[in-house]
């Protein structure tokens, strides 16, 4: 039975040209995390494998940095970066836990963080 929950940074906004940290945290489970995938539109941005560590997809090496922790930092943001991002925790024996973050990249300086929320 999957007992864990993922807490994420929820709906967030940031300024064009700036950077943002995407964060997820898995709690309430003793399952072993084998790999965390960060994805946007079904495309892998980065993976963090328990044995091999962090890897940034070759397509995103210039603008994506690992961490902090199991989070992901997006740099040099453009309006095209607006959209859904997913942290996918592959665990044993529970299976897969998915967290969703919606990022809005704004032209002006009115960017502010949304509330945190949980996905069961």
């Amino acid at each position: 039975m999957m007992t864990g929950t993922i807490e994420t940074t929820g709906n967030i906004s940031a300024e064009k040209g700036g950077s943002i940290i995407l964060q997820c945290h898995l709690s309430s489970t003793t399952a072993q995390v084998t790999q965390v995938n960060w994805e946007q539109q079904d495309q892998l941005l980065a993976i963090c494998n328990a044995d091999l560590g962090w890897h940034i997809s070759p397509s995103f090496k210039d603008r994506v940095a690992p961490g902090p922790g199991l989070g992901l930092t997006l740099q040099s943001l453009t309006v095209n970066d607006t959209g859904e991002y997913f942290c996918i925790y592959h665990t044993y024996p529970d299976g897969t836990y998915t967290g969703r973050i919606f990022l809005e990249v704004l032209e002006s300086s009115v960017a502010e963080h949304g509330a945190r929320f949980q996905i069961p």
Epitope: T34, Q35, N37, E39, D42, Q43, L44, I47, N49, D51, L52, G53, H55, S57, P58, H90, T96
Partner: antibody, heavy 122, light 107 residues
């Protein structure tokens, strides 16, 4: 051109260990992961493990955990696969394979060694 | 681990036939699916990566499609050198797992 050249066939007794080498050439050795794949006679392909030639970090398939060890020698651009506690079911061809994408461990295997037949028999 | 299931396990076809092999993943692997060809006594060769991208040097009669859990390898017009065993492989998470193979034989 890219080449992965493996060591020759081996015959081993049950309980023994075998060490197979895979010498890489034609590309930057430390930039691409190397995988090992086992194929028993008439059977399919079975992933065994992976090594990062740059830092030496490894990951192994659960069924080989504790029995397989991957190492590398950056001075000779060679990766080694050692399998211990051999049993007759380990009789197989062992392949090394290079990952397609630089510093990305899951890009597909674009170059393969010629294979090394390991026969385990008493 | 992600299970990969190929069908059929074998098929008989003639030169010039259109051949389709399917591969199903036990969970969503997006488009992280590769296809390999293996001839007897030889190492496998990468045909297609990321579901539909043809590896350099691979003839255009080979094509791949699909996303999520269901994928297809198509040979538009089977040639004598295409009689071989074909494997799918997911490259979404480690360990990268293979299908059991599909043997394409001469009818």
């Amino acid at each position: 051109q890219v080449q992965l050249v493996q060591s020759g066939a081996e015959v081993k007794k049950p309980g023994a260990s075998v060490k197979v080498s895979c010498k890489a050439s034609g590309y930057t050795f430390t930039s691409y992961y190397i995988h090992w794949v086992r194929q028993a006679p008439g059977q399919g392909l079975e992933w065994m493990g992976i090594i990062n030639p740059s830092g030496g970090r490894t990951s192994y398939a659960q069924m080989f955990q504790g029995r397989v060890t991957l190492t590398r020698d950056t001075s000779t651009n060679t990766v080694y696969m050692e399998l211990s506690s051999l049993r007759s079911e380990d009789t197989a061809v062992f392949y090394c394979a290079k990952d397609r994408e630089e510093q990305w461990p899951v890009g597909g295997f674009d170059y393969w060694g010629q294979g090394t037949l390991v026969t385990v028999s008493s | 681990d992600i299970q990969m299931t190929q069908s059929p396990s074998s098929l008989s076809a003639s030169v010039g036939d259109r051949v389709t092999i399917t591969c199903r993943a036990s969970q969503n692997i997006r488009r992280y699916l590769n296809w390999y060809q293996q001839k007897p006594g030889k190492a496998p060769e990468l045909l297609i990566y990321s579901a539909s991208n043809l590896q350099n040097g691979v003839p255009s009669r080979f094509s791949g499609s699909g996303s999520g859990t269901d994928f297809t390898l198509t040979i538009s017009s089977l040639q004598p050198e295409d009689f071989a065993t074909y494997y799918c492989q997911q490259s979404y998470i480690i360990p990268p797992t293979f299908g059991q193979g599909t043997k394409v034989e001469i009818r």
